[in-house]
């Protein structure tokens, strides 16, 4: 009765177990009772990343600059090329097949997490006591100016989009001692 299973680095063919080809190599011919599996290295710009019985190697991914892509890590015979996005852009998917411009946080929102090559900007609403008056992919919410520390008073309250406006102290409420 012929075998129905093989060990992990083998494959079943013609009722026998043949060695798989190592990563970086493709199958040229199956083994026989008396000859080993024949494998050949993948060519330039090709790869195979597992023990395999593939007769063709896979082409390395092309990082298309027209899509905002650039090479993050050059492929080898055992690994695919890894693409990332140009500065100011991020991948639209895990496979990084194209890029989009980083999102900016509108006035009233600040940057919680700056974008990377693979993730977009994360914005957060400015909480009470903080503001952002610009549309930016980098600026966090800024704290309102503390009028008190400048010996001034609040003349106009701040919002999530504007800073407080400070002004001089009310003279009537100020006691000056003249000597």
């Amino acid at each position: 009765e012929p075998p129905t299973a093989c060990r992990e680095k083998q494959y079943l063919i013609n009722s026998q177990c043949c060695s798989l080809c190592q990563p970086g190599q493709k199958l040229v011919s199956d083994c026989t009772e008396f000859t080993e599996t024949e494998c050949l290295p993948c060519g330039e710009s090709e790869f195979l990343d597992t023990w395999n019985r593939e007769t063709h190697c896979h082409q390395h991914k092309y990082c298309d600059p027209n899509l905002g892509l650039r090479v993050q890590q050059k492929g080898t015979s055992e690994t695919d090329t890894i693409c990332t996005c140009e500065e100011g852009w991020h991948c639209t998917s895990e496979a990084c097949e194209s890029c989009v411009l980083h999102r900016s946080c509108s006035p009233g929102f600040g940057v919680k997490q700056i974008a990377t090559g693979v993730s977009d900007t994360i914005c957060e609403p400015c909480p009470v006591g903080f503001f952002s008056n610009v549309s930016s992919a980098f600026e966090k919410c800024h704290p309102w100016t503390s009028c008190e520390t400048k010996d001034l008073v609040v003349q106009q309250a701040g919002t999530n989009k504007t800073d407080v406006v400070c002004g001089p102290q009310d003279r009537l409420r100020h006691h000056h001692h003249h000597h």
């Epitope: 060990r7 992990e8 680095k9 190592q22 008396f34 000859t35 080993e36 494998c39």
Partner: antibody, heavy 127, light 107 residues
Framework: EVQLLESGGGLVRPGGSLRLSCAAS????????MNWVRQAPGKGLEWVSY????????DYADSVKGRFTVSRDNSKNLLYLQMNSLRAEDTAVYYC????????????????????WGQGTMVTVSS | DIQLTQSPSSLTASVGDRVTITCRSS??????LAWYQQKPGKPPKLLIY???SLEVGVPSRFSGSGSGTDFTLTISSLQPEDFATYYC?????????FGQGTKLEIK
């Protein structure tokens, strides 16, 4: 130190059941294919069963097919052999053994061998 | 199933002798053969894998050769600790099988 330790052997009546365990230490058993091999008193080695690293693939000697079941718990580094409908001819020392794939990237093909063996556990089937 | 036949079944030799054990397969197994040494009351110990590759830590007096159906294990100069039983095993396909063993005794 890389070690395998079998347990669960003993005396059992014909038709009875027994579950052998094999505890791996010093290495991650889940990364290796494993085997059970037995040796009847005064006799040679007989391969009994195989299990792949994930437990997905199993195979058995014709003499135990349908009666024995090999399994593993990789989270506990344990290998098992469930033996049912035991017969007198199953009397033997049972060894668990690690399958290793020897590979030199400069060579074309690798090779298998059983490089780590337990001390064995004795199973006696008798009335 | 693939049958392995070892010869001789037993042999007596002296320290310093050169000893050869053969293993014949019922069908071609390329170089998917291993050799083991077993001493009484102990588990087998891997000596050779892939028909001719020496396992780490095994003395260089042990060597293996052959491919296809005919294989040999050679001990170039017997040492007292080499007296044991030797088994060949095919790992070409399931079911994996062992030879019946060769008992090497001291003369």
């Amino acid at each position: 130190e890389v070690q395998l330790l079998e347990s669960g052997g003993g005396l059992v009546r014909p038709g009875g059941s027994l579950r052998l365990s094999c505890a791996a230490s010093g290495f991650t058993a889940g990364s290796y294919e494993m085997n059970w091999v037995r040796q009847a008193p005064g006799k040679g080695l007989e391969w009994v069963s195989y299990i792949s690293s994930s437990g997905e693939t199993t195979d058995y000697a014709d003499s135990v097919k349908g009666r024995f079941t090999v399994s593993r718990d990789n989270s506990k580094n344990l290998l098992y052999l469930q033996m049912n409908s035991l017969r007198a001819e199953d009397t033997a020392v049972y060894y668990c053994a690690r399958d290793v794939f020897f590979f030199d990237s400069s060579g074309d093909n690798g090779a298998y061998g059983m490089d780590v063996w337990g001390q064995g556990t004795m199973v006696t089937v008798s009335s | 199933d693939i049958q392995l036949t070892q010869s001789p079944s037993s042999l007596t030799a002296s320290v310093g002798d050169r000893v050869t054990i053969t293993c014949r397969s019922s069908q071609g197994i390329r170089s998917s053969l291993a050799w083991y040494q077993q001493k009484p009351g102990k588990p087998p110990k891997l000596l050779i894998y892939g028909a001719s590759s020496l396992e780490v830590g095994v003395p260089s007096r042990f060597s293996g050769s052959g491919s296809g159906t005919d294989f040999t294990l050679t001990i170039s100069s017997l040492q007292p600790e080499d007296f044991a039983t030797y088994y060949c095993q095919q790992l070409n396909s399931f079911p994996s099988t062992f030879g019946q063993g060769t008992k090497l005794e001291i003369k």
